[in-house]
């Protein structure tokens, strides 16, 4: 009896694992084995596919074959008993194009109100992704074990910290990788769960802000208790993208080591141009807090996000404010080529009650003022980029008197 060729061959590639699956064409014939050949582009001869010779099942693994993953390959299969079937040719394919990204490895660390997630590619030193190792981004789904309500977090890198969690609570998460350059989305990792610890005695510092004064950076934060010492550390932001790297070499800012106030001042030349992460920790001598949330700090934006300069034209019931580019030393205006929002605070000179206007325009009207009254105005600029949520310091206050009545035209 003539053996029929096997049919419906499927090639599954996950990371560096190459799996072939096929259907027997004749279930009634026993003791049949199957063998594959392969052919590279531009070659006439067929080569035996190692790992896929004389296979009794309908699945084989040819991961050991050292292929150029960017080169097209053709496969053929036949059934064998006493005689052999004709060859069945599989459509040619490029391994890289066909490959799926496997589940990443996930390693969790818990704090009282935060979880640190370390993510690395599922296949170490993968051949398939050798040129793309630094291009992986990850997304995750996290939920409280007790509620199951899912939150998705997109576009994270190999180390990510989730804040504002509840103490003594079990959280579960799963992670998948993506190679956006190749339009590839991976498969999810198994679910990993971890319980946050009991609440720490000392909370971490909050609301960290960086501003520029003269040639210095001023770093400020809020803290719940008095008589504490603080330390500040920095890290190059790009290091968080480094796959498989679990050691983050946070560096001390020398002028911000063991400071006793909720701010520290350090020279701008501490940092070269770049994007950094900053974090602050509190200590009372016996205990230390966990580290604060990490803030992103871009020297380019920070250095030039100076307080706006403005002129006031006074009317009887309003001020017209004209915002101009801030001046550098030497009185040259600073070119700011990113969109800004302006926050204008004004108050009656004799009162503490402040009012606020937020405007994107550079000419702003402050309405509903009383005639012949001294009002003071200060302003600051904010970047409109959510990721680099930066603010300048406030300008010095400028005080002006409104005109007498009936001069509003």
């Amino acid at each position: 009896k003539n053996l029929k060729s096997p049919q419906k061959v499927e090639v599954d590639i996950i990371d560096d694992n190459f799996i072939l699956r096929w259907n027997r064409s004749d279930e009634s014939v026993g003791n049949v084995t199957f063998s594959f050949d392969y052919q590279k582009t531009g070659m006439d001869n067929w080569i035996k596919l190692s790992g896929c010779q004389n296979i009794t099942s309908t699945k084989c693994n040819f991961s050991s074959l050292k292929l150029n993953v960017y080169e097209e390959i053709k496969l053929r299969i036949r059934a064998e008993k006493e005689n052999t079937s004709s060859w069945y040719e599989v459509d040619s394919f490029t391994p890289f194009r066909k490959a799926q990204i496997g589940p990443p490895e996930v390693h969790l660390e818990a704090e009282d109100k935060a979880i640190v997630i370390h993510i690395s590619p599922g296949t170490k030193d993968s051949v398939m992704w050798a040129l793309d190792g630094l291009s992986f981004t990850y997304s995750l789904v996290i939920w409280k074990n007790s509620s199951g309500v899912e939150e998705r977090i997109e576009n994270i890198y190999s180390r990510h910290k989730i804040y504002k969690l509840s103490p003594e609570t079990t959280y579960c998460l799963k992670v998948k990788a993506a190679l956006l350059t190749s339009w590839k989305i991976g498969v999810y990792s198994p679910v990993h769960c971890i319980k946050t610890t009991v609440e720490n005695e000392l909370p971490p510092p909050e609301n960290i802000e960086v501003s520029v004064q003269n040639q210095n950076y001023v770093l400020k934060w809020d803290y719940t208790y008095a008589n504490m010492t603080f330390q500040v550390q920095w890290l190059h932001a790009f290091l968080k993208r480094n796959p498989g790297n679990h050691l983050y070499k946070w560096k001390q800012i020398p002028d911000c080591e063991n400071v006793k106030t909720t701010q520290c001042v350090f020279p701008q030349n501490v940092f070269q141009k770049g994007i950094y992460l900053l974090r602050v920790q509190a200590s009372d001598g016996n205990n230390t807090s966990f580290w604060s949330e990490e803030i992103k700090f871009d020297t380019e934006i920070q250095a030039f996000l100076l307080p706006p300069v403005f002129n006031i034209r006074s009317l009887s019931d309003s001020f017209h404010i004209y915002i101009g580019a801030p001046k550098q030393s030497g009185n040259t205006p600073v070119i700011q080529d990113y969109p800004l929002i302006y926050e204008i605070i004004f108050w009656e000179n004799t009162s503490n009650a402040e009012r606020k206007i937020i405007e994107k325009k550079t000419d702003v009207t402050v309405p509903n003022l009383k005639p012949l009254t001294v009002y003071c105005v200060k302003a600051r600029a904010h970047t409109m980029d959510e990721k680099l949520n930066k603010s300048s310091v406030f300008s010095d206050a400028v005080c002006e008197k409104t005109k007498p009545g009936n001069t509003s035209k």
């Epitope: 390693h107 610890t197 009991v198 070499k249 016996n286």
Partner: antibody, heavy 117, light 105 residues
Framework: EVQLQQSGADLVKPGASVKLSCTTS????????MHWVNQRTEQGLEWIGR????????KYAPKFQGKATITADTSSNTAYLQLSSLTSEDTAVYYC??????????WGQGTTLTVSS | DIVMTQSQKFMSTSVGDRVSVTCKAS??????VAWYQQKPGQSPKTLIY???YRYSGVPDRFTGSGSGTDFTLTISNVQSEDLAEYFC???????FGGGTKLEMK
């Protein structure tokens, strides 16, 4: 294969100084912290300090501040521990170890230092 | 400074037993704790990191647990080659516990 090869046993006199070495292979020390740990006879492990070989930044346990100096030579992938003003209390086995972020994953075989007149 | 305390200096066990070595941190350290095994005349070896993750090549009879201030290394089905000293470490401050020696009954 990752290896940390330490210098041989040393016998030195009280008051003297000594420099122990830890030559590594199979990785670039710039990518890790390198630590030194000592262990006195029948005692536990005691952390001395560490270096970031990439920029030479060091950190020491308070007890070893002024006693220990850690350096690194990235061209030879070697970390060093210098101990000064030695006393019999410094007699111990000294280990170098590599830090991958969550533990010391590779250790040298240890150098036995004996301080005796 | 963070202090890691291993209250039991010695523990007696028999082959096949289950034994738990404990370690207490002087303050909340999250899960940043590693466990090491040291046999006489040898360098320490990593068993557990991040409180509960088994280091590669470590037999699955070694299990780490705990968070905050209380941590445990459990060896189920103790083997004769497990007779050694065990150290915990808080790896952000690098502080080691005093060690617990596992002996045969």
């Amino acid at each position: 294969e990752v290896q940390l090869q330490q210098s041989g046993a040393d016998l030195v006199k009280p008051g003297a100084s000594v420099k122990l070495s830890c030559t590594t292979s199979g990785f670039n020390i710039k990518d890790y912290y390198m630590h030194w740990v000592n262990q006195r006879t029948e005692q536990g492990l005691e952390w001395i300090g560490r270096i970031d070989p990439e920029d030479g930044e060091t950190k020491y346990a308070p007890k070893f501040q002024g006693k220990a100096t850690i350096t690194a030579d990235t061209s030879s992938n070697t970390a060093y521990l210098q101990l000064s003003s030695l006393t019999s209390e410094d007699t111990a086995v000294y280990y170098c170890a590599r830090d991958w972020g969550h533990s010391f994953d590779y250790w040298g075989q240890g150098t036995t230092l004996t301080v005796s007149s | 400074d963070i202090v890691m305390t291993q209250s039991q200096k010695f523990m007696s066990t028999s082959v096949g037993d289950r034994v738990s070595v404990t370690c207490k941190a002087s303050q909340n350290v999250g899960t940043t704790v590693a466990w090491y095994q040291q046999k006489p005349g040898q360098s320490p070896k990593t068993l557990i990191y991040s409180a509960s993750y088994r280091y590669s090549g470590v037999p699955d009879r070694f299990t780490g647990s705990g968070s905050g201030t209380d941590f445990t290394l459990t060896i189920s089905n103790v083997q004769s080659e497990d007779l050694a000293e065990y150290f915990c470490q808080q790896y952000n401050s690098y502080t080691f516990g005093g060690g617990t020696k596992l002996e045969m009954k």
